[in-house]
């Protein structure tokens, strides 16, 4: 059987022969020489030669246990001659001995961390780890302790765990944000002889809102016209505060004063300023100047540094309205007149009034737009502001005139306004009645008495208050022995009625119909129309069959006998 | 280069004796055991025995146990086998090899021996 | 004493194929994972020439389309692809126990 124990080499060794690990034996070895001790496995016949008689293995070259602390290697005892193992093959281990010769290395060269400011002493920043590449299992090489070289009285570090704290109160990022720390980690316990490694921690303090917002004046002024639209912006304020990002995020609002419903304060984002601007039409004429309390707070707000005050400031703004030269108002925002469409020339429809709002009250001049006006129907007085008619009207032509006035300021023309005027044109019965359409109808030859041949239907261009009444009749030079009779239905509608039983369309083959048609209104109006009867040829049920043609064609010659 | 040079061709009468002699060089001849084989004509290798230069210690296969004697001289990195009692069955060419963990890793060019009346 | 069979005694086979010798043993030469068995190439008027050692290990300088197999009794030689200068007579031997035996050869031919 094989005779070794496990083997131990020192690392790092410096001598100048080959450093002696130990001796493979097999108690079949008779010590003649007939046995050869072979190697194999980790760094055979490179780190480790054997004596291939003896079994002596030597390690050729200086070993450095954190490179690898183990090998494992095989060993085997075979006769010479035969080539037969005397014994099986066999794993052994040659454990590399440690030596303090690893300083501890931090994982990173430079640390960065963050705190916030104010935070209370014992506050976790970061925790640094140094490694030591020595054996942790075999004395103090890899035992590690740590220490603050640089970043005191601010800052400290936890021995064993590396893990660094706040060490003062009160550290203000508004008096100083950066902090450079160097921590040290030593072997050996941190005892005497033992090795170091050092990192840099560039530590920021992080802001909290610990500030509140300032006002560097307690007082502004802004002048604004007085024709600034609402939305218009007329100043900038601004309050500055000491943190940052969201801490000095600053929020405007008019708290007090003669302007609050007159004026608005918005934040700008991005400048952190408020923003004046205009919320309602202003009037020089009513009032020259406003005041405003406006305050800028913090939005968001720290409890736990309430103690220091409140986290709000404001400030007095005076703004000027200044006088502007406007133009003419008009009293109404539109007039809307009437007039009868019989009306005469120069006939005064109404009037309209403006006024130059300033001080000064300017005299005013009005004119009609001609471009609203191109067939110079009205007119109007330059002085007064009355309107009349240039020319004659008529409802049933436009009923609706709308036209523009001018009112211009006549010490500075460049000052006008425009009102709209919508004027109605009323109606008047000046149009007759006449028929719907024009009407040809027929009758049969052997139409009987009283029979309805056509109905009548009537229109009038008036358009009178209480609705069209139209009235039906024969025309006096035919009322008289005539073959038909006109019934007036009393719905504005009449009926043709035949007057005897047959007709005979070789005596009479067409007859024509005088009506007239007369409106209820004043004065009345009324019109003749002419119906066209012609005699045809009917089958038993009443149907047209033929009639004479040319009495369509031919009208002329044709009795008027009906 | 390891080498292994072997004397020459032998021609001898039955009974008599000869002595085949292995020159090894480019190695340590007291390193490895020295083996000698022999091939009759036409037919395959057949193991002799061998020698550990160092200690003289010899092994010989039964067949040949009483006639063949090998030895070696240190001082010339030399191996010899003698054969004696010759018949016509020991013609042969006789190979001497230089045993390494049971093989034959290096051989000599052979020296024929003829056996005839 | 160790009889060793090889076989076939011949055979012949066209370049490019792949050729199989076996060789058994009488009785196992294989101890503790070694199989001390050993292969030889021999051409004409030529001394033999070490191939393989230990079953399966390729001596030092021969092409690597010689490979061996096998433990205890049972052991193959193989050539993966012949080539015209592998003509030769192969042989087995071991050194398990004295006395130290060959196989009777295998004869390769060319086709």
């Known amino acids: 059987s094989w005779m070794w124990n496990q083997f131990f080499l020192l690392e790092e060794y410096t001598g100048s022969d080959y450093q002696y690990v130990g001796k493979l034996h097999s108690d079949q070895d008779r010590g003649d020489g007939s046995l050869k001790y072979i190697l194999s496995g980790d760094g055979a016949g490179d780190l480790f030669i054997i004596n291939e008689n003896t079994g002596d293995i030597q390690a050729t070259k200086r070993l450095d246990r954190e490179e690898k602390p183990v090998y494992i290697l095989r060993a085997q005892a075979i006769n010479r001659r035969t080539g037969r193992p005397v014994e099986p093959e066999s794993e052994f281990i040659i454990k590399i001995h440690d030596i303090n010769d690893n300083e501890p290395i931090f994982t990173k060269e430079v640390y960065t961390a963050t705190v916030p400011e104010m935070s209370d002493v014992g506050t976790f920043v970061v925790q640094v780890t140094a490694t030591d590449a020595d054996d942790p299992t075999y004395g103090n090489s890899a035992k590690v302790v740590y220490s603050i070289l640089q970043g005191q009285p601010y800052f400290s570090v936890e021995s064993e765990t590396g893990i660094i704290k706040t060490a003062l109160l009160n550290m203000d990022r508004e008096n100083r944000e950066q902090y450079q720390v160097v921590i040290q980690a030593k072997d050996m316990g941190g005892q005497m002889g033992g090795l170091s490694g050092t990192t840099t921690v560039n530590i920021t303090l992080t802001d909290v809102n610990d500030n509140p917002p300032r006002f560097p004046q307690s007082t502004y002024q802004f002048k604004t016209p007085e024709s600034s639209p609402p939305g218009t912006p007329i100043g900038r304020i601004k309050a500055s505060d000491a943190d940052v990002g969201e801490n000095a995020e600053i929020e405007y609002s008019i708290t007090d004063g003669e302007g609050l419903d007159m004026f608005d304060v918005i934040t700008d984002q991005e400048t952190q300023e408020g923003i004046i601007t205009v919320k309602k039409l202003l009037d020089f004429e009513k009032k020259k100047v406003y005041t405003l309390k406006v305050e800028a707070s913090n939005p968001y707000v720290e409890p736990r540094f309430l103690y220091l005050g409140p986290f709000k400031d404001s400030a007095t703004v005076r703004i000027v309205v200044e006088d502007v030269d406007e133009p003419p108002v008009f009293s109404k925002l539109a007039y809307i007149l009437q007039i009868r469409e019989d009306a005469q020339i120069n006939t005064t429809i109404g009037s309209v009034t403006a006024q130059d709002p300033d001080a000064a009250r300017n005299p005013v001049k009005y004119s009609v737009d001609r471009h609203t006006d191109m067939d110079r129907i009205f007119n109007i007085d330059s002085g007064n502001g009355s309107i009349f008619t240039s020319k004659l009207l008529d409802r049933e032509t436009l009923l609706w005139h709308n036209i523009t006035v001018i009112a211009t300021e006549i010490n500075n023309p460049k000052q006008s306004s425009r009102v709209p005027l919508y004027i109605k044109v009323l109606d008047v019965n000046d149009n007759a009645p006449e028929f719907a359409e024009f009407y040809e109808t027929f009758v049969c030859e052997k139409a009987k008495a009283d029979q309805l041949i056509q109905t009548l239907h009537a229109v009038d261009k008036d358009d009178p208050y209480s609705g069209h009444q139209f009235s039906f009749s024969l025309a006096p030079e035919a009322a008289s022995g005539s073959n038909f009779t006109i019934q007036d239905n009393k719905d504005n509608t009449a009926g043709i009625l035949t007057r005897k039983n047959g007709y005979n369309r070789h005596e009479m083959s067409t007859y024509l119909l005088p009506v007239v048609i007369s409106d209820n209104d004043y004065p009345v109006q009324s019109s003749t129309g002419t119906v066209t009867v012609r005699v045809c040829a009917c089958d038993h049920h009443g149907n047209m069959q033929s009639c004479h043609a040319e009495a369509l064609i031919h009208p002329t010659g044709l009795s008027t006998g009906a | 280069e390891v080498q292994l040079v072997q004397s020459g061709a032998e021609v001898k009468k039955p009974g008599s004796s000869v002595k085949v002699s292995c020159k090894a060089s480019g190695y340590t001849f007291t390193n490895y055991w020295m083996h000698w084989v022999r091939q009759r004509p036409g037919q395959g290798l057949e193991w002799m025995g061998d020698?550990?230069?160092?200690?003289?210690?010899?092994h010989y296969t039964q067949k040949f146990k009483d006639r063949v004697t090998i030895t070696v001289d240190k001082s010339t990195s030399t191996a010899y086998m003698e054969l004696s009692s010759l018949r016509s069955e020991d013609t042969a060419v006789y190979y001497c090899a230089r045993g390494d963990l049971g093989r034959f890793d290096y051989w000599g060019q052979g020296t024929t021996v003829t056996v005839s009346s | 004493d160790i009889q060793m069979t090889q076989s076939p005694s011949s055979l012949s086979a066209s370049v490019g194929d792949r050729v199989t010798i076996t060789c058994r043993a009488s009785e196992s030469v294989s101890i503790h994972g070694t199989h001390l068995m050993h292969w030889y190439q021999q051409k004409p008027g030529k001394p033999p020439k070490l191939l393989i050692y230990?079953?399966?290990n390729l001596e030092s300088g021969v092409p690597s389309r010689f490979s061996g197999s096998g433990s205890e009794t049972d052991f193959t030689f193989t050539i993966s692809s012949l080539q015209p200068e592998d003509i030769a007579t192969y042989y087995c031997q071991q050194s398990f126990e004295d006395p130290w035996t060959f196989g009777g050869g295998t004869k390769v031919e060319i086709k």
């Open positions: 230990a079953a399966s």
């Open positions: 020698i550990d230069p160092s200690h003289s210690e010899t």
